[in-house]
Interface confidence: medium
């Protein structure tokens, strides 16, 4: 079938398009191109006669068209008006006609856009700002970029007017950013210059520094005030409600008790019209006051920060005392006192250092105690724990994983699957899982205060088939009559039955055998040497079953009471004495001999050639098992008679 393909289909103004003819019939007389969807002589562009190889322009010919011998038509320097349908009329040698229609669309090359704004200085939490991307262009798509990123998802951001207008409701200072718009059509894309949004905000509640509120007579008082504000705030100071001066700093030299009172800093933003105040109460002491504790770090980070607790106020020739948990200070390399005892420094705080802490000032008559102070130690997160501990799941069930990590403040959690972030929750829930949900499930716990994060990765397998299990043991070499052994069948799988075999038989009934943990754990209490057998575990569900390789229990035992052989105890002079000692033991014991209490050799066999009556005495075999830590021994009396003096004597070995 005769067809027309437009290459490209979307054409930029000024470029060219090729109307490519496919399946052109054989034996042609000629062909003609027409603008539109039908053959219309008034709209003929060009005709071509094959025999003469002659091309003839028609009424719709613009001088930009070129026809090729294969009937394809090239149109150059495209204009908007060229959009639409084009019809090829083919006349075959038998004068039977055939037609085909193709089309293309023309789009303008877009100009560089710009951003207009309805509010150049919006006020935080009050104003909205509408950015509009100019100019308005037909058939164009509008995109927005914030700090060169695509728009974040936010209920305060709204696109309208075909995405040409971006409205930020209730602007905040965090909206101060670079905004760009982009226009796109099928043939071009252009991006605007940046517009920086200048959000007016504040003043926030001012901060008065230093934080110290206790002073002694004769000191200088120098207070400074700061409040976050755009544009920068103007400051005023009031003492006990009376205006003092319009400066950021307040300085009063050589203060007295009369300078005690409330000191107010007022911050004013002339553009937002807002005022904020902060009040600090300054106390000037003429005599030692009740002490109080200040800390250089109210939220120290575990294993990272040191904390200096200072007993205020500073008084010359005074004894300072400290208590932790209502006890005097323990001796610890992590606790240091300054020379005057006024500052207690905790080096590398831990979560156990919360306190409470008290300091005291000793005077002639008594000790004044401060109020207790508790430290808020930031710690963690520790390595997160993912529960439940199953690693194998069957298709079709729901996967519900929970993550927990010890942390102060409480951790924020994120879940990743195969390294890709999923959600920021403590729980991960996926319903109706399939094999495609198999993968690496990572829980990431983050402590926003310390900036630390820890991760735990769990491999989840979703399969109808169960894996080959394996046996893990809490004790690879238990000692007889002493140890217990717990065998666990791995992995832990949901909706799975666990089975056990010993030497190929099902478990015997025994008070020393106990199944627990859904039969996944087999515990042998007070193992004996007879428990040294082959143990196999099996797992099964409704569609498959599998058995582990056998694990043989290696029970350490003995040494039992040794046996000396041969049993003879009477020998003739001149015979050879050859005593062998044996004791049941695992591992094999070490042997040693003593004759009449005197240590001999460390061998299993004792050999003495040509014995005499001098060899009479007690022969002791000692056995020891280094693995069980146990020892044993046996004593045998040997009598050697002069040759021929007594019947029934052994001739020796």
């Amino acid at each position: 079938k005769l067809t027309i393909e437009s290459t490209p289909f979307n054409v930029a103004e000024g470029k060219e398009v090729l109307l490519l003819v496919h399946n052109l019939p054989q034996h042609l007389f000629g062909y003609s191109w027409y603008k539109g969807e039908r053959v219309d002589g008034n709209r003929q562009i060009i005709g071509y006669v094959i025999g003469t190889q002659q091309a003839t322009p028609g009424p719709a010919y613009s001088g930009r068209e070129i026809i090729y011998p294969n009937a394809s038509l090239l149109i150059q320097n495209i204009i908007q008006n060229d959009t639409g349908f084009y019809t090829l009329h083919v006349i075959k040698s038998d004068l039977v006609n055939e037609e085909a229609t193709g089309q293309f669309r023309v789009y303008p090359e877009l100009p560089k856009p710009s951003i207009s704004s309805n509010n150049s200085k919006p006020v935080e939490d009050k104003d909205a700002v509408a950015f509009t991307c100019e100019p308005e262009t037909q058939d164009a798509t509008y995109l927005w970029w914030v700090n060169n990123q695509s728009l974040p998802v936010s209920p305060r951001l709204q696109l309208s007017n075909g995405n040409r207008t971006l409205t930020l409701f209730n602007v905040t200072r965090n909206d101060t950013a670079s905004y760009k718009c982009e226009t796109q059509n099928p043939v071009s894309a252009r991006r605007s210059d940046s517009v920086i949004l200048n959000v007016l905000y504040g003043p926030d509640a001012p901060t008065i520094s230093p934080l110290n509120t206790s002073y002694r007579s004769g000191e200088n008082l120098n207070l400074s005030c700061h409040a976050a504000s755009n544009p920068p705030a103007q400051y005023s100071w009031f003492v006990n409600g009376t205006f003092q001066q319009s400066t950021q700093e307040l300085f009063i030299p050589n203060i007295t008790v009369n300078n005690s009172g409330s000191y107010t800093c007022q911050a004013h933003n002339s553009d937002t019209g807002l005022n904020r105040t902060t009040v600090t109460t300054i106390t000037v002491y003429a005599e030692p006051p009740k002490p109080f504790i200040t800390s250089n770090n109210s939220n120290p980070v575990e294993d990272e920060d040191a904390v200096a607790l200072t007993c205020e106020p500073e008084i010359q020739n005074t004894t300072y005392l400290w208590w932790v948990n209502n006890q005097s200070l323990p001796v610890s390399p992590r606790l240091q006192l300054s020379n005057d005892n006024r500052t207690l420094t905790l080096l590398s705080v831990t979560r156990n250092d919360v306190g409470p802490y008290e300091c005291g000032i000793q005077n002639e008559l008594s000790v004044d105690h401060s109020d207790p102070v508790i430290l808020n130690v930031l710690y963690g997160p520790d390595d997160p724990t993912i529960s439940p501990s199953y690693t194998y799941y069957r298709p079709g069930v729901n996967l519900s994983l929970s993550c927990h990590a010890a942390s102060n403040p409480p951790a924020q959690y994120s879940w990743l699957i195969d390294g890709n972030i999923q959600q920021h929750t403590q729980e991960l829930f996926i319903s109706n899982i399939t094999e495609k949900n198999s993968g690496l499930y990572t829980c990431q716990a983050n402590n926003s205060a310390s900036g630390h994060s820890r991760t735990t990765v769990k491999t989840i397998t979703v399969s109808a088939e169960l894996p080959k299990p394996s046996i893990s043991s809490n004790n690879s070499k238990p000692v007889e009559d002493k140890d217990a052994v717990a065998f666990t069948c791995e992995p832990e799988a949901q909706n799975t039955t666990y089975l056990w075999w010993v030497n190929g038989q099902s478990l015997p009934v025994s008070p020393r055998l106990q199944l627990s943990n859904g039969n996944r754990t087999l515990t042998l209490f007070n193992v004996t040497r007879n428990d040294a057998r082959a143990y196999v575990c099996g797992i099964q569900n409704s569609v498959s079953a599998n058995r582990s390789d056998p694990v043989t229990l290696d029970v350490l035992y003995g040494p039992d009471t040794p046996i000396i052989s041969p049993p003879d105890s009477s020998y003739l002079s001149g015979a050879n004495l050859n005593l062998s000692c044996h004791s049941a033991s695992n591992p094999s014991p070490q042997y040693s001999w003593r004759i009449n209490g005197i240590p001999q050799q460390h061998t299993q066999v004792l050999f003495i050639a040509k014995i005499t009556p001098n060899n009479n005495g007690t022969y002791a075999c000692f056995v020891s098992n280094l693995a069980t830590g146990r020892n044993n021994s046996i004593v045998k009396s040997i009598t050697v008679s002069a040759s021929g003096t007594s019947p029934g004597l052994s001739a020796g070995a």
Epitope: K436, S438, T461, V462, E465, P467
Partner: antibody, heavy 124, light 110 residues
Framework: QVQLQESGPGLVRPSQTLSLTCTVS????????MHWVRQPPGRGLEWIGW????????EYAPKFQGRVTMLVDTSKNQFSLRLSSVTAADTAVYYC?????????????????WGQGSLVTVSS | DIQMTQSPSSLSASVGDRVTITCRAS??????????MHWYQQTPGKAPKLLIY???NLQSGVPSRFSGSGSGTDYTFTISSLQPEDIATYYC????????FGQGTKLQIT
């Protein structure tokens, strides 16, 4: 029998879009993540990305981000790769593949079933 | 991205030799008891073929002379007794995050 078969033009002009289709037989495409990997002449293997035919989710290697699109037609058991604005550096054998059909293993990202590969040359 | 460094890039050995290829990842590719490292063989003009998955598991139908080991960042692929049909390029690949391949080791027989 499990098979993957790549098809598409062997020659693409610079700046144009490379398009390849992978036809799957012997299993249901929806059950597995489907991947594209390429190998420039005389060079090593480069992973391009995956598509989950069940829902159309995709993930691409950072190198190809912005140029690559993967689509799926589950009715035909086919998935496709489109790589735009190609240059001579995109000349390569392109393989479609999938992971562990015969192994009960948890990672979606090793490949024991491969197509035979389709050589695409980028040249004017 | 985790980068893979495979060495050597090429090697020659005789029939019957023991051949070892190593692959090092820029960070650990082990997690929760698995090592996400795999090995492929590619003969000229053919698609790669999976030999070893998860560091040490032999893919079904692959001869037992091929083996793999390792954990964390360092992995080894071994051919215990080289055969003439083992002439190929071998690639490691991790799947701990988005997958990347090693640059390949071309094995020739002397």
């Amino acid at each position: 029998q499990v098979q993957l078969q790549e098809s598409g033009p062997g020659l693409v002009r610079p700046s144009q879009t490379l398009s390849l289709t992978c036809t799957v037989s012997g299993f249901n495409i929806k059950d597995y993540y489907m991947h594209w990997v390429r190998q420039p002449p005389g060079r090593g293997l480069e992973w391009i990305g995956w598509i989950d035919p069940e829902n159309g989710d995709t993930e691409y290697a950072p190198k190809f981000q912005g140029r690559v699109t993967m689509l799926v037609d589950t009715s035909k058991n086919q998935f496709s790769l489109r790589l735009s604005s190609v240059t001579a550096a995109d000349t390569a054998v392109y393989y479609c593949n999938t992971r562990g059909l015969s192994t009960m293993i948890t990672t979606r990202w090793f490949f024991d079933v491969w197509g035979q590969g389709s050589l695409v040359t980028v040249s004017s | 991205d985790i980068q893979m460094t495979q060495s050597p890039s090429s090697l020659s050995a005789s029939v019957g030799d023991r051949v070892t290829i190593t692959c090092r990842a820029s960070k650990s590719v082990s997690a929760s008891g698995y090592s996400y490292m795999h090995w492929y063989q590619q003969t000229p003009g053919k698609a790669p073929k999976l030999l070893i998955y998860l560091a040490s598991n032999l893919q079904s139908g692959v001869p037992s002379r091929f083996s793999g080991s390792g954990s964390g960042t360092d992995y080894t692929f071994t051919i215990s007794s080289l055969q003439p049909e083992d002439i190929a390029t071998y690639y490691c690949q991790h799947s701990r995050e988005l997958p990347t391949f090693g640059q390949g080791t071309k094995l020739q027989i002397t």
